[in-house]
C-alpha cells in the first residue's frame, strides 16, 4: 500500500501552502525507501536517494514556480509515481446567511471568506437548540445534528425542511480542502429570517366611470403554504408615470382601490408582503404593474364590486404577465377597501 495518505481531492495531486515547506510523497514505494526525484520535463536530479529523506521530497518555502508534476523513481530506476503539486491555503470560516420564504422551511447559503485556490467542498448540518434542565448536560437525540441537504446542482445552498417556527437552530457550515477544515456556526430562528417572496399576479385595472380610481389585485406568493396557519399582510405603493415619489397604503386583503390616482396618467403599482404578526422582514417588491384610470363618465348604475366591465371609452391597462394562478380563498381578515362613492 502507498505510504502517502490520499488527501481529499483528485488522485495524484498533493498540496502545500505558499511560503511554507512542502513535503511530496512518492506513492508507489514502501515508506522509507530511498528514491530520486525529478521535475517532470526536466532531466536534472532534484533530490537523490542519498538525501536521507526516504520516499519524500522536501521543497523549502514553496512558491508558484514549484507547482507542477514531479517524478519519483526507485534506486534501480523504476517509476515510483508522478505527483502533481498544487499550492493554496487552508480553509477560512465561510460566510453564511440563512433566509426563509415561508414559516416551515429555510435555506442557508455560503461563500468562502478567502479563496483557497484548492478543491473545496462544504459540509452542512444543523441541530435544534433546546434549553435542557440544569441537571442534564446530555444533548437530546431529537435535536440532531442532521444533515442540511445541499442543492444537487452545486449551488452553495442547503435547505432545512419542516422547521419549527418557534425553535432556534444552529447551522454548521464547514469548508473542507486538502489542507484542513474550518467551521462557521450560525444561530437562526425562523421568526427573524422570515422574508416572504413578493406577492404574485399583480393586476391593475381601471374602475369604469371613476377617472381617479384604480383597482389593484394580487395573490399570495406560490412559496407560501397553501393552507397557511400564518397569514400575510401587504403594503402597496403606487405613483403616476414620471412622478418620483411613491404613495404607500397597507391594504386589508388581496386587493386595493386607489382613490387618488391622477386622471389620464398611467400609474405604476407594486406590492410587498410580510408575516401578519411582523415576524421577519418585508418581501422585496413585486414587479411593477401599470394601469391608467378610466376616462369615461360615471355610469348610472354602479355594478356589483368585482365584476368585469365593458369599458365605455378606454380598455383598462393590465400588467404584462400572464394571468395569475387562482388566488387563495380570501382570509377572514380580508375586507373590501373602498372609498365612498
Amino acid at each position: 500500500s502507498s505510504p502517502c495518505p490520499q488527501a481529499w481531492g483528485p488522485p495524484g495531486v498533493q498540496y502545500g501552502q505558499p511560503g511554507r515547506s512542502v513535503k511530496l510523497c512518492c506513492p508507489g514505494v514502501t515508506a522509507g525507501d530511498p528514491v530520486s526525484w525529478f521535475r517532470d520535463g526536466e532531466p536534472k536530479l532534484l533530490q537523490g536517494p542519498d538525501s536521507g529523506l526516504g520516499h519524500e521530497l522536501v521543497l523549502a518555502q514553496a512558491d508558484s514556480t514549484d507547482e507542477g508534476t514531479y517524478i519519483c523513481q526507485t534506486l534501480d530506476g523504476a517509476l515510483g509515481g508522478t505527483v502533481t503539486l498544487q499550492l493554496g491555503y487552508p480553509p477560512a470560516r465561510p460566510v453564511v446567511s440563512c433566509q426563509a420564504a415561508d414559516y416551515e422551511n429555510f435555506s442557508c447559503t455560503w461563500s468562502p471568506s478567502q479563496i483557497s485556490g484548492l478543491p473545496t467542498r462544504y459540509l452542512t448540518s444543523y441541530r435544534k437548540k433546546t434549553v435542557l434542565g440544569a441537571d442534564s448536560q446530555r444533548r437530546s437525540p431529537s435535536t440532531g445534528p442532521w444533515p442540511c441537504p445541499q442543492d444537487p446542482l452545486g449551488a452553495a445552498r442547503c435547505v432545512v425542511h419542516g422547521a419549527e417556527f418557534w425553535s432556534q437552530y444552529r447551522i454548521n457550515v464547514t469548508e473542507v480542502n486538502p489542507l484542513g477544515a474550518s467551521t462557521r456556526l450560525l444561530d437562526v430562528s425562523l421568526q427573524s429570517i422570515l422574508r416572504p417572496d413578493p406577492p404574485q399576479g399583480l393586476r391593475v385595472e381601471s374602475v369604469p366611470g371613476y377617472p381617479r380610481r384604480l383597482r389593484a389585485s394580487w395573490t399570495y406568493p406560490a412559496s407560501w403554504p397553501c393552507q397557511p396557519h400564518f397569514l400575510l399582510k401587504f403594503r402597496l405603493q403606487y405613483r403616476p408615470a414620471q412622478h418620483p415619489a411613491w404613495s404607500t397604503v397597507e391594504p386589508a386583503g388581496l386587493e386595493e382601490v386607489i382613490t387618488d390616482a391622477v386622471a389620464g396618467l398611467p400609474h405604476a403599482v407594486r406590492v410587498s408582503a410580510r408575516d401578519f404578526l411582523d415576524a421577519g422582514t418585508w418581501s422585496t417588491w413585486s414587479p411593477e404593474a401599470w394601469g391608467t384610470p378610466s376616462t369615461g363618465t360615471i355610469p348610472k348604475e354602479i355594478p356589483a364590486w368585482g365584476q368585469l366591465h365593458t369599458q365605455p371609452e378606454v380598455e383598462p391597462q393590465v400588467d404584462s404577465p400572464a394571468p395569475p394562478r387562482p388566488s387563495l380563498q380570501p382570509h377572514p381578515r380580508l375586507l373590501d377597501h373602498r372609498d365612498s362613492v
Partner: antibody, heavy 117, light 107 residues
Framework: QVQLVQSGAEVKKPGASVKVSCKAS????????MHWLRQRPGQGLEWIGN????????HYNQKFKDRATLTVDKSTSTAYMELSSLRSEDTAVYYC??????????WGQGTLVTVSS | DIVLTQSPATLSLSPGERATLSCRAS??????LHWYQQKPGQAPRLLIK???QSISGIPARFSGSGSGTDFTLTISSLEPEDFAVYYC?????????FGQGTKLEIK
C-alpha cells in the same frame, strides 16, 4: 534477467523510413523509461529520445524531433523507433536502452541501419 | 545544448597504473554527470552516476568526482579489461548529451 532484443540490420535508401523494434523481457515493462540512442561509425553516442513507462510521454532531442517517432506496445513489451527521411549520415548502430528518467542501465545489442543509394 | 569536452582524446597507460579521465561541461551542471564504458562491438555500460555514485556490480577501482563544470573518472589500478572507450553524459538539461569519448589504450 533483463533482456532487450532488437530487430535485425536494415539497409535503406535515402528518403526512406526505418522502424527498429526492441522487445523487453525479465522486468515489468511499464515501470521503466525506454531510451533510444545511436552511434555513427567511429563516432560518439547521440541520444534520440525517451518514452515514459506508463503514459508513453516522450522527450525528443530537437535534432531528431521532426523525423523520429517513439512508440510502445505494452501488450508485447516492445518499444519502437521510427526514423523517416533517411540520409546517408543516418547510417549508425541504433540502441534501445532501459533506464530511469535520464540514465541508461541496460542496453539492447544494437541494430545497424545502413542508408545507401 | 550542453557540450561536454573530454580529455585526453587518447590515454596510453599500462595495467596497474592509475587512470584519470576528465570531462568538462560548457555550463554548470551540478552533479548531473554520468560515466559509461564501451568496449569494441559492445553496447556501453554505466559505471558511475551523478558524478560520484557507484553502480552495483561495477568494481570499486572505478570512482568519480567533481561538480559544476569539471569532473573526473579515476581508475585506481588498471586491469586489462579496463582498456576501452569512456564517455561522460550529462542529464542537467534536454537533450541528454555525451562527450566525444576518451580512448584508454594499453601502452
Amino acid at each position: 534477467q533483463v533482456q532487450l532484443v532488437q530487430s535485425g540490420a536494415e539497409v535503406k535508401k535515402p528518403g526512406a523510413s526505418v522502424k527498429v523494434s526492441c522487445k523487453a523481457s525479465g522486468y515489468t515493462f511499464t515501470n521503466y523509461w525506454m531510451h533510444w540512442l545511436r552511434q555513427r561509425p567511429g563516432q560518439g553516442l547521440e541520444w534520440i529520445g525517451n518514452i515514459g513507462p506508463s503514459d508513453s510521454k516522450t522527450h525528443y532531442n530537437q535534432k531528431f524531433k521532426d523525423r523520429a517517432t517513439l512508440t510502445v506496445d505494452k501488450s508485447t513489451s516492445t518499444a519502437y523507433m521510427e526514423l523517416s527521411s533517411l540520409r546517408s549520415e543516418d547510417t549508425a548502430v541504433y540502441y534501445c536502452a532501459r533506464g530511469d528518467y535520464v540514465l541508461f542501465t541496460y542496453w539492447g545489442q544494437g541494430t545497424l541501419v545502413t542508408v545507401s543509394s | 545544448d550542453i557540450v561536454l569536452t573530454q580529455s585526453p582524446a587518447t590515454l596510453s597507460l599500462s595495467p596497474g597504473e592509475r587512470a584519470t579521465l576528465s570531462c568538462r561541461a560548457s555550463q554548470s551542471i551540478s552533479n548531473n554527470l554520468h560515466w559509461y564504458q564501451q568496449k569494441p562491438g559492445q553496447a556501453p555500460r554505466l559505471l558511475i552516476k551523478y558524478a560520484s555514485q557507484s553502480i552495483s556490480g561495477i568494481p570499486a577501482r572505478f570512482s568519480g568526482s567533481g561538480s559544476g563544470t569539471d569532473f573526473t573518472l579515476t581508475i585506481s589500478s588498471l586491469e586489462p579489461e579496463d582498456f576501452a572507450v569512456y564517455y561522460c553524459q550529462q542529464s542537467y538539461s534536454w537533450p541528454l548529451t555525451f562527450g566525444q569519448g576518451t580512448k584508454l589504450e594499453i601502452k
